[in-house]
């Protein structure tokens, strides 16, 4: 999953039990409330490693957001925390529980509003907007050679049907803002810019909203000129992680390359007590590399199962093409198994699965 920086989560003081799989729980909270969303394993059996997702984007634990395998606890809700929340099995991405959360300006009275007076008579449950294909929205960086065309899409659903608008670098974006204009297809949730130029570089945000909530996705566009270059790796990935002994961990590495990239995952090791060779090159072992049946998508994720203390250390995503190489590194800290609900420190995500 992708760990977005704009996503925040909601809560209220009482724990809310999860709905049956396939059902969507409609919840309304007041501003400033705290919540515990609970997702017990289906049938009471073991559920394995899980991940909590808001509007298709993985939630990052923080001081305000506490993530456990069966619970999501969040403090001090605000309007931006409205959205679609789900608990998924990490490996299969199967949705175990799904919640539609709306945060109102007024603090809640403790009773869940059902919003019937506001609902359009469509015969369908009302709900905040959500991404229809969240797994397609994990790439955020688009690097395009000048003179080509860019298409951004944010397909969403909700009831009532949400509207979509677009921002560039946080400001309203309209056709008159660029030479050549833009093409919008609201039914396709699309923005098209033909024949891009360097001045088109920037952050493009789709804002999808209805009266029950708002979700947004930001894409970064880089317009490339002249010569090809070595691969671009998305900033912040892979991210440092802290994991509990025996849990599963995923490192992510987003690679953009015009020329076909070759991606490898490396773990830094010590040889005779030294981390680097005589020439200063780090000692590494190759954990994952391209094979006959390996896709680029698969290579962008390194999965570590049932981690041990020996798995702790530095991991590197190395991407190369005919022009050159780029690499980003991250650290894994492995803690002894203690409590299921843990807080992340500033180093990164915690998965107690």
């Amino acid at each position: 999953e992708s760990l977005g920086t704009e996503q925040r989560v909601v809560g209220r003081a009482a724990e809310v039990p999860g709905p049956e799989p396939g059902q969507q729980e409609q919840l309304v909270f007041g501003s400033g409330d705290a919540v515990e969303l609970s997702c017990p394993p289906p049938g009471g059996g073991p559920m394995g490693p899980t991940v909590w997702v808001k509007d298709g984007t993985g939630l990052v634990p923080s001081e305000r957001v506490l993530v456990g395998p069966q619970r999501l606890q969040v403090l001090n809700a605000s309007h931006e925390d409205s959205g679609a929340y789900s608990c998924r099995q990490r490996l299969t991405q199967r949705v175990l529980c799904h919640f539609s959360v709306r945060v109102t300006d007024a603090p809640s009275s403790g009773d869940d509003e059902d919003g019937e007076d506001e609902a359009e008579d469509t015969g369908v449950d009302t709900g905040a907007p959500y991404w229809t294909r969240p797994e397609r929205m994990d790439k955020k960086l688009l690097a395009v050679p000048a003179a080509n065309t860019v298409r951004f899409r944010c397909p969403a659903a909700g009831n009532p049907t949400p509207s979509i608008s677009w921002l560039k670098n946080g400001r309203e974006f309209r056709g008159e803002h660029r030479i050549g204009g833009i093409k919008l297809r609201h039914q396709q949730w699309s923005l098209v810019m033909e024949s891009v130029v360097p001045s088109d570089r920037g952050n493009y945000t789709c804002v999808v909203e209805n009266k029950f909530g708002s979700i947004r996705q930001t894409y970064t566009l880089d317009v490339l000129e002249r010569s090809p270059h070595r691969p671009i790796l998305q900033a912040g990935l892979p991210a440092n992680q802290t994991a509990v002994l025996g849990s599963d961990v995923e490192f992510h590495c987003k690679v953009y390359s015009d020329a076909q990239p070759h991606i490898q995952w490396l773990k830094h090791v010590e040889v005779n007590g030294s981390k680097v060779g005589p020439d200063g090159t780090p000692y590494v072992t190759v954990l994952k590399t391209a094979g006959a049946n390996t896709t680029d998508k698969e290579l962008e994720v390194l999965s570590l199962h049932n981690v041990t203390f020996e798995d702790a250390g530095e991991y590197t995503c190395l991407a190369g093409n005919s022009i050159g190489f780029s690499h980003h590194s991250a650290w894994l800290v492995v803690l002894p198994a203690e409590e299921e609900l843990v807080e992340a420190d500033e180093a990164g995500s915690v998965y107690a699965g």
């Epitope: 955020k140 688009l142 050679p145 080509n148 860019v150 899409r153 490339l224 015009d258």
Partner: antibody
Framework: EVQLVESGGGLVQPGGSLRLSCAAS????????ISWVRQAPGKGLEWVGR????????NYADSVKGRFTISADTSKNTAYLQMNSLRAEDTAVYYC????????????????????WGQGTLVTVSS | DIQMTQSPSSLSASVGDRVTITCRAS??????LAWYKQKPGKAPKLLIY???FLYSGVPSRFSGSGSGTDFTLTISSLQPEDFATYYC?????????FGQGTKVEIK
């Protein structure tokens, strides 16, 4: 004004070779590409291959792979289609077309669109 | 390869008619579909890209729709210059493939 002009077509015997040229003007294809498409007499369009100038990559249809080679001289703004081991079924009008990419981050692919076409040059493979 | 099948193969229509041509892909091509128009002895011309986006300079009587495997090209009011052969083409899969063409003739 964008223009593409093909040349080099003609009559060639089976097993022979021919080199087609596509001279471009009104744009530079350093960031875009050139595709070759052919049309046998009375038949539909068949994509032959594409040269992507940004990284110099090429892609080919299975029917011509290993026999045809697409290249370009960016200083001359000209693309080439080198055709070897020609067969009777290669007889067609060959078009070059400026090709640009529609980069769709959500779909996870690049859609290649041919927006300007040359007038075509006829290649006849016959003994 | 992804097979593109157009229907009908040919049709007869009059000036002012509304004409619809369909294109079906043998597998999902998302919205990676373009439509081209070709007159006899001439090179093809791009009409529509990404299934529904009108290429610059193309009259608004042309429109495209669809996604996945089923696509439609519509000419809302046929004009004399529209009598031609129309091709769909996908490029999300390799190789790019065209439909067999639909010939629009004068009734």
């Amino acid at each position: 004004e964008v223009q593409l002009v093909e040349s080099g077509g003609g009559l060639v015997q089976p097993g022979g070779s021919l080199r087609l040229s596509c001279a471009a003007s009104g744009f530079t294809f350093t960031s875009t590409g050139i595709s070759w498409v052919r049309q046998a007499p009375g038949k539909g369009l068949e994509w032959v291959g594409r040269y992507w100038a940004w990284d110099g990559s090429t892609n080919y249809a299975d029917s011509v792979k290993g026999r045809f080679t697409i290249s370009a001289d960016t200083s001359k703004n000209t693309a080439y289609l080198q055709m070897n081991s020609l067969r009777a079924e290669d007889t067609a009008v060959y078009y070059c077309a400026r090709t640009y990419g529609i980069y769709d981050i959500y779909g996870g692919y690049t859609e290649y669109v041919m927006d300007y076409w040359g007038q075509g040059t006829l290649v006849t493979v016959s003994s | 390869d992804i097979q593109m099948t157009q229907s009908p193969s040919s049709l007869s229509a009059s000036v002012g008619d509304r004409v619809t041509i369909t294109c079906r892909a043998s597998q999902d091509v998302d919205t990676s579909l373009a439509w081209y128009k070709q007159k006899p002895g001439k090179a093809p011309k791009l009409l529509i890209y990404s299934a529904s986006f009108l290429y610059s300079g193309v009259p608004s009587r042309f429109s495209g729709s669809g996604s996945g495997t089923d696509f439609t090209l519509t000419i809302s009011s046929l004009q004399p210059e529209d009598f031609a052969t129309y091709y769909c083409q996908q490029s999300t899969g390799h190789p790019q493939t065209f439909g067999q063409g639909t010939k629009v003739e004068i009734k």
